[in-house]
């Protein structure tokens, strides 16, 4: 159930076609989870600052049941910062990503949970 959320001050008009699809495919590959379970939420046009500057920035979160940990998170950060830099032109040093290892019992889906 990986869920990736990007809040950014980049306008919707600068979000390229296919960005959601690309995030989905790349996260499926990185986490080893099926694409149909990957959820992505891109929230553009936000009023944001990073280091006191309103230059392009992003505050992100990645929730997953397992597949979260030190080495894996570094790998995710490289992947996701790369995508944000290439597609949204956000410098990697203006991106924060919080990682959450979810308990299956605490994730609801399809009338139940993953537990």
């Amino acid at each position: 159930m990986p869920m990736f959320i990007v809040n950014t001050n980049v306008p919707r008009a600068s979000v390229p076609d296919g960005f959601l699809s690309e995030l989905t495919q790349q996260l499926a590959q990185a986490t080893g989870k099926p694409p149909q379970y990957i959820a992505v939420h891109v929230v553009p046009d936000q009023l944001m600052a990073f280091g006191g500057s309103s230059e392009p920035c992003a505050l992100c979160s990645l929730h997953s049941i397992g597949k979260i940990g030190g080495a894996q998170n570094r790998s995710y950060s490289k992947l996701l910062c790369g995508l944000l830099a290439e597609r949204l032109r956000i410098s990697p040093d203006r991106v924060y990503i919080n990682y959450y290892d979810m308990n299956a019992a605490n994730v609801g889906w399809n009338n139940s949970t993953f537990a």
Epitope: N9, P11, R12, A13, S14, V15, P16, D17, G18, F19, L20, S21, E22, D45, R89
Partner: antibody
């Protein structure tokens, strides 16, 4: 019905500066869309120049020299293209267009009729 | 920036003939958009998101493709389809247009 109408000086001399205006009716420039400038050169080549979004954020074609800027007047529902130090290579028909969004895509769904700019001494 | 190359640059077709216009991208793009322009008028959105017909576009038009190869097809050419067609991508900054294909009726 959404309509966009460009207006401009028509003929200018090299090195001069100018402003083109796009007046929008039937849609507010402060709600949910982005508003773009696109030009078409005499040989019919189309070039995307940049936009101003509903929030007032701007984006420009990085491959163009930054001799232009896009601003707006929300009270008149107008947005503008300021061109500085024009050259003969800026001779073109200038279109304004609205960008709307679908799932994972954006597209220019309404265009103005265009205003022709000729740069000549 | 991504360069879009349309072929052919100019073509003509008989009424009722099937017509295919192609657009080749220098790098992979996610979706392609198409515009129709007639002399003295502004471009009109014709197909968006590769295969979705814009409002009012006849169903004889269709769009397809993926990666670096996209096409616009007219199942049966009609006189009113004579125009110049442009492809456009917004998958990679900056957004770019193809050079156009001028379609004439025989």
């Amino acid at each position: 019905d959404v309509q966009l109408q460009e207006s401009g000086p028509g003929l200018v001399k090299p090195s001069q500066s100018l402003s083109l205006t796009c007046t929008v009716t039937g849609s507010s420039i402060t709600s949910d869309y982005a508003w773009h400038w696109i030009r078409q050169f005499p040989g019919n080549k189309l070039e995307w120049m940049g936009y101003i979004s509903f929030s007032g954020s701007t984006g420009y074609n990085p491959s163009l020299k930054s001799r232009f800027s896009i601003t707006r007047d929300t009270s008149k529902n107008q947005f503008f293209l300021q061109l500085n130090s024009v050259t003969t290579e800026d001779t073109a028909t200038y279109y304004c267009a609205r960008e709307a969004y679908g799932y994972d895509v954006g597209y220019f769904d309404y265009w103005g009729q265009g205003t022709t700019l000729t740069v000549s001494s | 920036q991504i360069v879009l190359t349309q072929s052919p640059a100019i073509m003509s077709a008989f009424p009722g003939e099937k017509v295919t216009i192609t657009c080749s991208a220098s790098s992979s793009v996610s979706y392609m958009h198409w515009f129709q322009q007639k002399p003295g008028t502004s471009p009109k959105l014709w197909i968006y998101g590769t295969s979705n017909l814009a409002s009012g576009v006849p169903v004889r038009f269709s769009g397809s493709g993926s990666g670096t190869s996209y096409s616009l097809t007219i199942s049966r050419m009609e006189a009113e389809d004579a125009a110049t067609y442009y492809c456009q991508q917004r998958s990679s900054y900056p957004w770019t247009f193809g050079g156009g294909t001028k379609l004439e009726i025989k």
